[in-house]
């Protein structure tokens, strides 16, 4: 399927609001960083066809657009660049859903890897039991944003591969 | 698990409009859609529209167009429907239903509806 | 834009026998996409299969669904005294999101 043409740059433009949504330096908050054990291995790219692929990219946008759209992360960011941030992720959710409804046209094939998907979930399940223990603190916030633009720089390299295999 | 409470039933006359509201609780999202399905009596479903409550992203079917409003506040997460220029025809229970954010993967999810409310009946009537 | 046809439109049977349950689509809907759901009188619908084949928390594994393509089947392997409702198959298109449901299918005890 083609990801239109605007993907990278929606991607990008999001990385780019995440990081000016930063509200404290992140070396005041190194006694709280925390290695949430991204599952880099689902998002190398070799082993996927495109639609589990996208799956496995989809999963990872709307887990995110989940922790963003929360109440707790309503006071934690600025209301104005949350909204475009999370509109971003829901502009990508759409493009991915619609490349794997054209996949889907094209021939029926596995929508996902079962277990890459759990450890996507299970992932975003160590990020918000890390933000309920240290109870939505600034610098929980801080640290899960640090951690996202590192997943999502990670998922931007995924997407950039599916397009050159296009 | 997510709870869907909607409003009671209503009296509508022709012409007039109807808002019939839906609440969720549980473990809600405002990240998934919140949709509207109506049905007459001894008739079957219908897809009206949905809302993305976090970003307040409406869609409409072609049918209802012009005459349907899908709003919805955040916190206590609720869905309302407004329908406007009501017609006999319009009388049916109206459900509103929302996918699970439990479902893998989540590109599933927004593609079924996993919660229904109880239904709300409007008779229009002159 | 997709219609869903079920048939029959009622099916009379003994608790005990099998049911199948047809919904052809107009034009082609990938398997991911197809739902299917069941209501009982004056309840609201209850989602049983999604994806095509998987089954719904909750539901008996005597519910199954199958196909592809444009033809797509509930099958229910021993009818059960609570099985006997309305069934509906439902799909999902996108760009921009369409949910579209077929008339539905009774199955009455005979």
């Known amino acids: 399927c083609d990801l239109p043409e605007t993907h990278s740059l929606d991607n990008r433009r999001t990385l780019m609001l995440l990081a000016q949504m930063s509200r404290i330096s992140p070396s005041s908050c190194l006694m709280d960083r925390h290695d949430f054990g991204f599952p880099q291995e689902e998002f190398d790219g070799n082993q996927f066809q495109k639609a589990p692929a996208i799956s496995v990219l989809h999963e990872l946008i709307q887990q995110i657009f989940n922790l963003f759209t929360t109440k707790d992360s309503s006071a934690a960011w600025d209301e104005d660049l949350l909204d475009k941030f999370c509109t971003e992720l829901y502009q990508q959710l759409n493009d991915l859903e619609a490349c794997v409804m054209q996949e889907e046209r094209v021939g029926e094939t596995p929508l996902m890897n079962a277990d890459s998907i759990l450890a996507v979930k299970k992932y975003f399940r160590r990020i918000t039991l890390y933000l309920t223990e240290k109870k939505y603190s600034p610098c929980a916030w801080e640290v899960v944003r640090a951690e996202i633009m590192r997943s999502l720089s990670l998922s931007t390299n995924l997407q950039e591969r599916l397009r050159r295999k296009e | 698990e997510v709870q869907l409470l909607e409003s009671g039933a209503e009296v509508k006359r022709p012409g007039s409009s109807v808002r019939v509201s839906c609440r969720a609780s549980g473990d809600t999202f405002s990240s998934y859609p919140i949709s509207w399905v109506r049905q007459a009596p001894g008739q079957g479903l219908e897809w009206m529209g949905r809302i993305l409550p976090a970003l307040g992203v409406t869609n409409y079917a072609q049918n209802f167009r012009g005459r349907i409003t899908i709003t919805a506040d955040k916190s206590p997460l609720t869905a309302y429907l407004e329908l406007s220029s009501l017609r006999f025809e319009d009388t049916a229970v109206y459900y509103c239903a929302s996918p699970s954010a439990d479902i893998i993967p989540s590109i599933l999810g927004t593609t079924l509806f996993a919660f229904w409310g109880q239904g709300s009946l409007v008779t229009v009537s002159s | 834009e997709i219609v869903l046809t079920q048939s029959p439109g009622t099916l009379s049977l003994s608790p005990g026998e099998g049911a199948t349950l047809s919904c052809r689509a107009s034009?082609?809907?990938?398997?991911?996409?197809l739902t299917w759901y069941q209501q009982k009188p004056g309840q609201s619908p209850r989602l049983l299969i999604y994806g095509g084949s998987s089954r719904a928390t909750g539901v008996p594994d005597r519910f199954s669904g199958g196909g592809s393509g444009t033809d797509f089947t509930l099958t229910i392997s021993r009818l059960e005294p609570e099985d006997f409702a309305v069934f509906y198959c439902q799909s999902y298109h996108s760009p921009p999101p369409v949910y579209t449901f077929g008339q539905g299918t009774k199955v009455e005890i005979k």
């Open positions: 034009q082609n809907v990938s398997r991911h996409y």
